[in-house]
């Protein structure tokens, strides 16, 4: 009662391999790595057959089929390319994930190469079965920022795409009687978060209580160049308005806030985030040059008091920018202490500007980012936020602009952006 000699399947083997198989002998059919046993349209690792009493095998020898990982999953803000000809998805085939450059980059700087494993899954050496993450590229505008010194006071225009992180924040407080409307600037930190100054988002009350404006009253414009033409801009409503809990209206200490957008904004040449600095108390060093942009007052003949009294918020139609040097804390403190009025320059602030004046930020520029180029990382970093200035006119001699020192708040910002109160689980690269 011998059974016929067995031929192992292509890409497979039979164990045990014997010269003769008799009644009740069993053999196990298995496949090479990267192949699976195919029997009656079912896929399995091994298949057992037995030599029956009548000298026949209990089943036919199955075939070995190459493992197929199937079509790779799509990647948010990324794409997948096949490294193997004919877009093969079978064992040992390779694919490469990449992010939508230059607006997104891969987290952990992985190669993005995945191989179809013997288990039928696309696998990466580092990430194993997890997909890579495409994070927004920060602080790298698609057009290089020029070295020209321009001014916001009496200034010239910025070109579209020079400050892709720049946001116009419009607050229309309909809870007020009569309605109150004002604006400020902000800086995009990720697809869903805007960094700005707390005083921009504080309700303009008749007392000094710090109460944030309702989220329903906030509109954010991104990719905006000329405020008269908002057609090319992305506008978004706010999901949350978060003022720093210690913001003090009397001295503008802790003048920092966040807006979470209702929906993530698509990034592109005109909408890109700015980088946050490393958390360090020193802040930017004196004499370092920074850039700040805004739609605030650009007419040097109009006084701040005239604007406040008239109730209008005169603004520049086209985004303006200025290059300003950081001023030492001691010099700035001294310049304000010599003035009448209670002006305290705290450790959470730094100053920028020229002793001789002429270049400055002004009313309406509030909340915009003071950005400095970081040579090490080759990114622009938001070191400051336009906060306040002296009692004299913008650009006056020896009146420096005062900026919120962002590096003192990096931990608070990450905490808020990743808190469970955030509307969605939005990842931001640290």
């Amino acid at each position: 009662n011998e059974c016929p000699k067995l031929q192992p399947p292509v890409y497979g083997k039979i164990e045990p391999s014997q010269a003769v198989y008799s009644f009740k002998d069993q053999v196990l059919v298995s496949c090479d790595t990267g192949y699976k046993v195919l029997k009656d349209n079912g896929v399995m690792d091994t298949f057992q057959i037995e030599c029956l009493k009548d000298g026949a095998w209990s089943n036919k020898i199955p075939t070995c089929k190459i493992v197929d990982c199937g079509a790779p999953a799509g990647l948010k803000h990324g794409l997948v390319t096949f490294s193997t000809r004919n877009n093969l998805t079978t064992y040992k085939s390779e694919i490469r994930y990449s992010c939508q450059q230059p607006y997104y980059k891969m987290l952990h700087n992985t190669t993005g190469v995945y191989t179809c494993s013997a288990h039928g899954t696309w696998t990466n050496e580092v990430l194993k079965r997890s997909l890579p993450t495409c994070l927004p590229v920060c602080g790298q505008p698609s057009r290089a920022l020029p070295n020209l010194v321009k001014r916001i006071i009496g200034g010239r225009n910025a070109e579209l795409g020079l400050f892709p992180w720049q946001a116009l924040i419009v607050v229309e407080d309909t809870s007020r009687v009569p309605n109150d409307k004002w604006f400020g600037s902000g800086a995009l930190l990720s697809e869903s978060w805007i960094l700005t100054a707390a005083h921009v988002l504080r309700s303009q009350r008749r007392d000094n209580t710090v109460i944030p404006v309702s989220k329903e009253h906030v509109t954010v414009y991104l990719g905006l160049h000329d405020v008269r033409d908002k057609s090319g801009a992305v506008n978004s409503s706010a999901a949350r308005v978060i003022l720093h809990p210690d913001f003090n209206i009397q001295n503008y200490n802790h003048d920092i806030a966040l807006v979470q957008l209702q929906k993530p904004v698509p990034l592109g040449a005109h909408v890109m985030p700015i980088c946050l600095p490393r958390p360090e108390p020193e802040g930017p060093a004196p004499h370092m040059l920074g850039l700040v942009a805004g739609w605030g007052i650009s007419n040097p003949n109009v006084t701040v008091d005239e604007i406040i009294l008239s109730g209008t918020r005169t603004l520049s139609d086209v985004l303006q920018y200025v290059k300003l040097p950081v001023v030492s804390h001691a010099e700035c403190k001294a310049s304000y202490e010599s003035r009448s009025g209670n002006y305290s320059v705290t450790e959470n602030m730094f100053c920028a500007g020229y002793y001789e004046g002429g270049k400055d930020t002004c009313l309406g520029d509030s909340g915009g980012a003071f950005v400095i180029f970081d040579e090490m990382s080759q990114h622009w970093v938001a070191q400051g936020l336009v906060s306040w200035g002296g009692p004299e006119e913008c650009g006056s001699k020896q009146v420096y602009g005062v900026y919120t020192k962002v590096s003192n708040y990096v931990d608070w910002l990450w905490e808020e952006m990743n808190s469970p109160r955030a509307v969605r689980d939005l990842q931001v690269e640290r």
Epitope: D173, T174, S175, R176, V177, H199, S203, R205, R206, D207, N208, T209, I211, S214, I249, Q250, N251, Y252, V304, D305, I308, G341, N342, Y343, W388, P391
Partner: antibody, heavy 114, light 112 residues
């Protein structure tokens, strides 16, 4: 139009408590605080405290921290002030105001008498 | 606590005259950052609720006649009625909102 309607006059015995109401209409109740002000007969105005309906935060004039309790019912857009341990010194007209004093209630006269 | 002192406590003027009344605070009510003085003026006519006239020391509340003008900064403030009308008979109060709220004692305006 904006209105703040206060509850009617109260005659209460010394040592008792009284709860005054102020119903708001015509504006966003939660986005504006409600202030309470006391005026004794023939005297000036005295600020008692304010309450902010959006988050329930309250600020009191120190003098009134043990005397008054401020609350709101957002569902009915109504603010309340309860006055405790009343004495003749508490006999006064009590006003509520809203939208940062742009609008005032008509006042509630509280008379404390045995 | 901030103390508010109003003067005079009362004054009598004829219709059409210009009148000024003063309000002094025990500390500055100016917040340099906002360039605002946190001081308001109220009018209370006999048997009525108070009415807001001026806030931020000089901003007229909507609907208030332009004969009412607020001025001053820091600790010294003035309410001016350029041409007094019979209906201006009232007590005028100032109030600070720099640190919580405090009312002044009031100035009673009588018409001769």
């Amino acid at each position: 139009q904006v209105q703040l309607k206060q509850s009617g006059p109260e005659l209460v015995k010394p040592g008792a408590s009284v709860k005054l109401s102020c119903k708001a209409s015509g504006y966003t109740f939660t986005s504006n605080d409600i202030n309470w002000v006391k005026q004794r007969p023939g005297q000036g105005l005295e600020w008692i405290g304010w309450i902010y309906p959006r988050d329930g935060s309250i600020k009191y004039n120190e003098k009134f921290t043990d005397k008054a309790t401020l609350t709101v019912d957002v569902s009915s857009s109504t603010a309340y002030m309860e006055l405790h341990s009343l004495t003749s010194e508490d006999s006064a007209v009590y006003f509520c105001s809203g939208v940062e004093d742009s609008y005032w209630g008509q006042g509630t006269l509280v008379t404390v008498s045995s | 606590d901030i103390v508010m002192t109003q003067s005079p406590s009362s004054l009598a003027v004829s219709a059409g005259e210009r009148v000024t009344m003063s309000c002094k605070s025990s500390q500055s009510l100016l917040i340099s950052r906002t360039r605002k003085n946190y001081l308001s003026w109220y009018q209370q006519k006999p048997g009525q609720s108070p009415k807001l006239l001026i806030y931020w020391a000089s901003t007229r509340e909507s609907g208030v006649p332009d004969r009412f003008t607020g001025s001053g900064s820091g600790t010294d403030f003035t309410l001016t009625i350029s041409s007094v009308q019979a209906e201006d008979l009232a007590v005028y109060y100032c109030k600070q909102s720099y640190n919580l709220y405090t009312f002044g004692g009031g100035t009673k305006l009588e018409i001769k």
